[in-house]
Amino acid sequence: LCQGSNYSTCASCPSCPDRWMKYGNHCYYFSVEEKDWNSSLEFCLARDSHLLVITDNQEMSLLQVFLSEAFCWIGLRNNSGWRWEDGSPLNFSRISSNSFVQTCGAINKNGLQASSCEVPLHWVCKKCPFADQALF
């Protein structure tokens, strides 16, 4: 069940771990605390998930319903162009940097924002659901 890469489309699985929200075929974790981008990434990876990679405008719009004005880290970085952590380019939305240190991406209810990766922000993890919550 839900085998394969972190980034692959999940099958329709029954449930998500505690404190994770099921939406569509994925589980999402919206953090309460704040960390820098690298620490946020490590948090997600340690829980067999990844910093949020948004696949299309529809997913982005759906997720923004759950967001506030506060920015959250997502799996988006500028390495010679804005790319998601799965290696795919950002091609359904726009983000621009105002300074050379703004190389990580964040999201709030209004859209995407470039930021210095050092800024402590909330973050969003994404993973496939598990058949058995006890596995988490």
Partner: antibody, heavy 120, light 107 residues
Framework: EVQLVESGGGLVKPGGSLRLSCAAS????????MSWVRQAPGKGLEWVAT????????YYPDSVKGRFTISRDNAKNTLYLQMSSLRAEDTAVYYC?????????????WGQGTLVTVSS | DIQMTQSPSSLSASVGDRVTITCRAS??????LAWYQQKPGKAPKFLIH???TLAEGVPSRFSGSGSGTDFTLTISSLQPEDFATYYC?????????FGQGTKLEIK
Amino acid sequence: EVQLVESGGGLVKPGGSLRLSCAASGFTFSRYYMSWVRQAPGKGLEWVATISISGGNTYYPDSVKGRFTISRDNAKNTLYLQMSSLRAEDTAVYYCAREGGYGNLWFAYWGQGTLVTVSS
Amino acid sequence: DIQMTQSPSSLSASVGDRVTITCRASENIYSALAWYQQKPGKAPKFLIHNAKTLAEGVPSRFSGSGSGTDFTLTISSLQPEDFATYYCQYHYGIPFTFGQGTKLEIK
């Protein structure tokens, strides 16, 4: 209310050293890049140094590189500028400045400045 | 390094006038430009970022425009408190360079 208060300016001889401080209040200091900008008497503004949130990255123009060192103490909400091998052309009012947030490196807030005079 | 050149260096105008100050970059800086106002003996005040976005609390008579290499700061109707020196600044990369300033004086 954001407040930046510089101190440590004064008269120093050429070749001497001085350390400026900037006490920050009214915001979460450890979330922002900080900078020093100076202004020689009757002249324009010149960027002097910028430091990242953690202090791990520092940036300088060629005019002060190797002579000035920017640092910060996030526990004390204080920014520093250590100046050495001072020259007459370093005479200026030195301003501490905070960025706009998220690494937006314009100078959104400024202190009142502290005067450094380099003269024999 | 990117050089910023302001014109004019000084300008005389009257209360109520519309005034435009120009800033030119030595190469394309897209919209990475800020404007500041400074009064004698005081610290600069942040006015505009990204060439046209007004900082919080800045009166709407101030506006910025331009992209690439040519930028303008416009004051639509000068008020007595607007007489000051204005600086532009490149804010994307190192070094963060300022223009030499434009002194706006009362005619």
